[in-house]
Interface confidence: low
């Protein structure tokens, strides 16, 4: 049988019934159970530095009678490599350095074999090799670097991160992987728990605004962070959260704007900004004004990017009636965190000093244009209406009025310069043109460079000062054989003069030439008139031409009446009525002209 | 020259009115403000009013209104206070003054004086 | 009204001393604040404007200081004509307010 001389023999059994025996660094006796072995197993530690061989142990047979007839072979996990065998004297030795971190176990097989015939002398053995453990690995952290947020002002104890480091070493077996955690770097402000690696806070009022960014160094260390135990660290980064610890300020007690009265509602005039340490919603700062003597005649508006508060015009001002307005602005956080109340109000207030500018307005007519009316037989000098300015500013500054003469460049109309009378200067005419446009000028005396501009439209009303005339020059001529009450002619007449009521015109024989006419004027009432024959026959040889004057009439007031003349020739006509000689014979007989008889 | 010439001491009986004049010279009269401070043995100095002679604006310690009327004319670089209902109180010596100009920002400040108008009340 | 409390209300100093005459606002003036000189019988005359400025020909041995609701008027170099009564005066709003006056005289 193999065995181990070193081993104790369990009595009671005779050798020749044990296999294989083993000697070495075996921890405790094999024991045997009916035919089969146990094998306890080999311990050998790990990182062995020596430089010889490390010693495992010695196979021995029974059979073995040391005269080198027997060879003992290795096999199974690392066998030739790792672990090399004395094939005579049966020593086992590990050959490198062992780590229980790669692998804790080797599993061997060992046989006794008969050099001669190459048969094993024994049943194959199996036993193990147990790489005993020791400290040769530090703690490793999950994280090279961990971040953690936490609010400011927390209370101690807070949670604010746990930390996790791990050791390769054998839990199982002395305190090679008990980790112990411990702060490095972070008091007074952090601490950790040291079993747990939970980080907390340490201190009360951890002010943001003082500090945000800790660096907090944590170590892990093995054998229950005993003497001799390996570590490793980590880094911790945390950030401090801000909460709304901090009210508003305005950085100075009194701000001064000033604004011309002419802003208008709306006008940013100005703008404030408190300061406020917190950050985000904390330092969303809303602005009101509070009191004061400008309290509704200006507005404050919170920009929302800038966190400015922009003071804007409310009403409109008036230099002339307050020049100085005094306000009180309040800046405060809409975002108040209750449990900070007791560092007072989270508001702050500024005197805002408001200064009016003076702006010279100039004069404002009364109407955004003026339309008057004069007749056109109005004499020089009549009054045609009148224009008003005044002085926007409280003082009412006296105005002059005077007309552009750009747009009366002959000079038909002026204006009294202190009252706005306007009047004419020239005589009008109506017929020529119907309609004035011109511009007056309203000045303030004290101040020319203030002026307005007001257009007047001035219609010249009509009068009947235009007698109606032809409507074109009549040169008519009649048959020699006309009859009596032949219509000969058609006047129509036309007036420069526009009466309300529409033209109404009269047509008749000018009294000098009614009596005794060789013609008739036939008035037919619609503004035309016919000339008629008034015999039978006309003699050309006897009278060529005659000369009708014919007076036309309106029916306005006062009438207008004119005369206009009507040539009438003597013609020799076909039967159809058709002329075929019409000579002035009045040029051989000069007397042969007149006008009717 | 900057100049505030004030017309001369009145003597008034309770219950009357009294019309003062300032005329000013050596500068632009209708650029700067005009103030009145009256001048008491009990009260030390004390501000009246403005008045702007450009645009004729007023404005009146709420004390003196109803009491004291500003009013101007430009054409004579003049400015008045008429002053009403007159009592024993009243009795002060009375001052125009000329306010610094807009540029300083500084309106109430007074830089030049007229030499005062005594206004004594008595039955 | 703001009131103005001058202090004190009259002093007796030497030729060549420095004096100093206090004037304190019932509320923040934010400097709107003048100095005035009335000598026997004459009109007031300003001295300082916006609480440090110098008027015009004032000599520069008179000083004006301060903020806020506290001011003061510095005299160096005491001189004889220097004998008045001195008021200061806010201009923060209407109406604009005096004191009462200090009365300065030479030992």
């Known amino acids: 049988t193999l065995s181990t001389p070193l081993s104790k023999r369990t009595s009671g059994f005779p050798a020749k019934k044990r296999a294989l025996e083993l000697s070495g660094n075996s921890k405790n006796e094999l024991s045997r159970s009916k035919r089969s072995w146990m094998w306890n197993q080999f311990f050998l530690l790990e990182e062995y530095t020596g430089s010889d061989y490390q010693y495992v142990g010695k196979l021995h047979s029974d059979q073995d009678r040391g005269d080198g007839s027997l060879k003992y072979i290795l096999s199974g996990d690392g066998a030739g490599d790792l672990f090399i065998i004395n094939e005579n004297t049966g020593d086992i030795q590990a050959t490198k350095r062992l780590d229980r971190e790669e692998k804790p176990v080797y599993i061997l097989r060992a046989q006794a074999i008969n050099r001669r015939t190459g048969r094993p002398v024994e049943p194959e053995s199996e036993f193990i090799i147990k790489i005993h453990d020791i400290n040769d690995n530090e703690p490793i952290f999950t994280k090279e670097v961990y971040t953690a947020t936490v609010p400011e002002m927390s209370d101690v104890g807070t949670f604010v991160v746990q930390v996790t480091a791990t050791d390769a070493d054998d839990p199982t077996y002395g305190n090679s992987a008990k980790v112990v955690y411990s702060i490095l770097q972070g008091q007074p402000y952090f601490s950790v728990e040291s079993e747990t690696g939970i980080i907390k806070t340490a201190l009360l009022n951890m002010d943001r605004e003082n500090r945000e960014q800790y660096q907090v160094v944590i170590q892990a260390k093995d054998m229950g962070g005993q003497m001799g135990g390996l570590s490793g660290t980590t880094t911790v980064n945390i950030t401090l959260t801000d909460v709304n610890d901090n009210p508003p300020r305005f950085p100075q007690s009194t701000y001064q704007f000033k604004t011309p009265e002419s802003s208008p509602p709306g006008t940013p005039i100005g703008r404030i900004k408190a300061s406020d340490a917190d950050v985000g919603e904390n330092a969303e700062i809303e602005y009101s004004i509070t009191d004061g003597e400008g309290l509704d005649m200006f507005d404050v508006i919170t920009d929302q990017e800038t966190q400015e508060g922009i003071i804007t015009v409310k009403k409109l001002l008036d230099f002339e009636k307050k020049k100085v307005y005094t306000l009180k602005v309040e800046a405060s956080n809409p975002h108040v965190e209750p449990r900070f109340l007791y560092l007072g109000p989270f508001k702050d207030s500024a005197t805002v000093r408001i200064v009016v500018e003076d702006v010279d307005e100039p004069p404002v007519f009364s109407k955004l244009a003026y339309i008057l009316q004069i007749r056109e037989d109005a004499q020089i000098n009549t009054t045609i209406g009148s224009v008003t300015a005044q002085d926007p500013d409280a003082a009412r500054n006296p105005v002059k009025y005077s007309v552009d003469r750009h747009t009366d460049m002959d000079r038909i109309f002026n204006i009294d310069s202190g009252n706005g009378s306007i009047f004419t200067s020239k005589l009008l005419d109506r017929e020529t043109l119907l309609w004035h446009n011109i511009t007056v000028i309203a000045t303030e005396i004290n101040n020319p460079k203030q002026s307005s501009r007001v257009p007047l439209y001035i219609k010249v009303l009509d009068v009947n000062d235009n007698a109606p005339e032809f409507a074109e020059f009549y040169e008519t001529f009649v048959c020699e054989k006309a009859k009596a009450d032949q219509l000969i002619q058609t006047l129509r007449a036309v007036d420069k003069d526009d009466p309300y009521s529409g033209h109404q015109f009269s047509f008749s024989l000018a009294p000098e030439a009614a009596s005794g006419s060789n013609f008739t004027i036939q008035d037919n009432k619609d503004n035309t008139a016919g000339i008629l024959t008034r015999k039978n026959g006309y003699n050309r040889h006897e009278m060529s031409t005659y000369l009708l004057p014919v007076v036309i009439s309106d029916n306005d007031y006062p009438v207008q009446s004119s005369t206009g003349t009507v040539t009438v020739r003597v013609c020799a006509c076909d039967h159809h009525g058709n002329m075929q000689s019409c000579h002035a014979e009045a040029l051989i007989h000069p007397t042969g002209l007149s006008t009717g008889a | 020259e900057v100049q505030l010439q004030q017309s001369g001491p009145e003597l008034v009986k309770p219950g009357d009115s009294v019309k003062m004049s300032c005329k000013a010279s050596?500068?632009?009269?209708?650029?700067?403000?005009m103030a009145w401070v009256r001048q008491s043995h009990r009260k030390s100095l004390e501000w009246i009013g403005y008045?702007?002679?450009?645009?004729?604006?007023?404005d009146y310690s709420q004390k003196f209104k109803g009491k004291a009327t500003l009013t101007v004319d430009k054409s004579s670089s003049t400015v008045y206070m008429e002053l009403h209902s007159l009592t024993s109180e009243d009795s002060a010596v009375y001052y125009c003054?000329?306010?610094?100009?807009?540029?300083?920002?500084?309106?109430?400040?007074?830089?030049?004086w007229g030499q005062g108008t005594s206004v004594s009340v008595s039955s | 009204d703001i009131q103005m409390t001058q202090s004190p209300a009259s002093l007796s100093a030497s030729v060549g001393e420095t004096v100093t005459i206090t004037c304190r606002a019932s509320?923040?003036?934010?400097?709107?604040l003048a100095w005035y000189q009335q000598k026997q019988g004459k009109s007031p005359q300003l001295l300082v404007y916006?609480?440090?400025l110098l008027a015009d020909g004032v000599p520069s041995r008179f000083s004006g200081s301060g903020s806020g609701t506290q001011y003061s008027l510095k005299i160096n170099s005491l001189k004889s004509e220097d004998v008045a009564r001195y008021y200061c005066?806010?201009?923060?709003?209407?109406?604009?307010?005096f004191g009462s006056g200090t009365k300065l005289e030479i030992k």
């Open positions: 509320e923040n003036i934010d400097s709107y």
């Open positions: 050596g500068y632009t009269f209708t650029d700067y403000y």
């Open positions: 005066q806010h201009y923060y709003r209407t109406p604009p307010t």
């Open positions: 008045i702007f002679p450009n645009s004729g604006g007023t």
């Open positions: 003054a000329r306010e610094l100009g807009a540029d300083y920002g500084d309106y109430y400040a007074m830089d030049h």
């Open positions: 916006s609480a440090t």
